[in-house]
Interface confidence: medium
């Protein structure tokens, strides 16, 4: 261990003063996994990058601390930095989708990815499939795959077709889908996270 802590510190030290301030404010409202508490506001706002890294690791441990940090960075629009953080903290697994090189590797987290855990619910409840397709197109979906999903007549069948490509995806590819879901149907993701 220790690698995740270093990666968190590296990410936070690369933020501008304004970005670090924004990071702390977002950290105060970001959804947390069940069983985890929130870092007290008073302590949080006065911390520098090093203190904040130590606090994140002590509150959330390294693995979840890194995941949480990456989520907040993504919420701030810093996708590249979030990807680098995750790539630095996890080994890759799974092949890239046909014709497309995988994004920076990040799999090997314990258990199933959110996308796999909630496959049935996502197939049944995602309504804005094409919004997702546009977010994934060129990144994890080839044109052929994109067209195949879009050709399906209903949202559930579109989602089923989309899921037919996910066995070849690594953790980061699945994170891209989760991020797109957060952007298009955040209430659904929050609902499933609570379930």
């Amino acid at each position: 261990m220790g690698r995740a802590r270093d990666a968190i510190l590296d990410a936070l030290e690369n933020l501008t003063a304004e970005e670090l301030k924004k990071f702390k404010l977002k950290l105060l409202s970001v959804p947390l996994r069940e069983g985890y508490g929130r870092i007290p506001r008073g302590a949080l706002l006065s911390m520098d990058a090093l203190d904040l890294t130590d606090k994140l690791v002590s509150f959330y441990l390294e693995t979840y601390g890194a995941e949480l940090t990456a989520n907040v960075l993504r919420d701030m629009g810093l996708q590249e930095m979030a990807g680098q953080l995750q790539a630095a903290t996890h080994q890759g697994s799974g092949a890239a989708p046909a014709g497309i090189q995988a994004p920076p590797q990040s799999a090997a987290k314990p258990g199933l990815h959110f996308i796999d855990q909630h496959r049935a619910a996502l197939i049944a409840r995602v309504t804005n499939v094409e919004w997702l397709l546009d977010a994934l197109y060129g990144k994890v979906l080839t044109d052929e795959q994109y067209q195949a999903v879009r050709a399906e007549p209903t949202n559930p069948s579109k989602m089923r077709k989309l899921f037919s490509f996910t066995p070849a995806w690594n953790w980061t590819c699945k994170d891209l889908l989760l991020q797109a879901l957060r952007e298009s149907q955040s209430y659904l993701v929050e609902d499933l996270e609570r379930s």
Partner: antibody
């Protein structure tokens, strides 16, 4: 502010090749694709192809498959288009543009004028 | 390839009146969710500028006098009321399937 800046005008000989650049700033470079579009003097727009810079994924219009090669350099947030075996038919303005959701082209560079002449 | 046919090729409209430009696709570019048709404005010596994306969504910073409509194969760009600065060539473009293609353009002149 999102900006795309293309390299300057080129005057080249028939049969040669040229490599033009499109430098981007103001957004996360790896999040969007960059498309290239050709416009001959006084004529309409032709879609050449695009590159998703995060992973180098490219798609080409069949018509330009043997003519254009798209590459990118993440470090400098720059996309390149190389055109080979140039003829007078390739004389045109070439635009790069950012590919956004729905694959509309939301930001365009000023264009690079290519003149192929002996 | 999907062929986009714009009409008219040119039109002259009086200041303050309505300009209507049509774009017809050789096959449908719409799904149940979106119509993958976009509209651009190009002035001499300048690159095109995106006005409308996904058939009817106005780009930020584009005046509300521009509007887009249509689905399937038939799409329309309306400008009302037309202003002096709207003199330009307008292009439709689809992104339904590869290759994405543009219409031939409609030149708008202000009388």
């Amino acid at each position: 502010e999102v900006q795309l800046q293309q390299s300057g005008a080129e005057l080249v000989r028939p049969g040669s090749s040229v490599k033009m650049s499109c430098r981007t700033s103001g957004y996360t470079f790896t999040n969007n694709g960059i498309t290239w579009v050709k416009q001959r003097p006084g004529q309409g727009l032709e879609w050449i192809g695009y590159i998703y810079v995060g992973n180098g994924y490219t798609e080409y219009n069949e018509k330009f498959k043997d003519k254009a090669t798209l590459t990118s350099d993440t470090a400098s947030s720059t996309v390149y288009m190389q055109l080979n075996s140039l003829t007078s038919e390739d004389s045109a303005i070439y635009f790069c543009a950012r590919l956004d959701r729905g694959r509309a082209l939301d930001y365009w560079a000023q264009g690079t004028t290519l003149t192929v002449s002996s | 390839d999907i062929v986009l046919t714009q009409s008219p090729a040119s039109l002259a409209v009086s200041l303050g009146q309505r300009a209507t430009i049509s774009c017809r696709a050789s096959k449908s570019v719409s799904s149940s969710a979106y119509s993958y048709m976009h509209w651009y404005q190009q002035k001499p010596g300048q690159p095109p500028k995106l006005l409308i994306h996904l058939a009817s969504n106005l780009e930020s910073g584009v005046p509300a006098r521009f509007s887009g409509s249509g689905s399937g194969t038939d799409f329309t760009l309306n400008i009302h009321p037309v202003e002096e600065e709207d003199a330009a060539t307008y292009y439709c473009q689809h992104s339904w399937e590869l290759p994405y293609t543009f219409g031939g353009g409609t030149k708008l002149e202000i009388k």
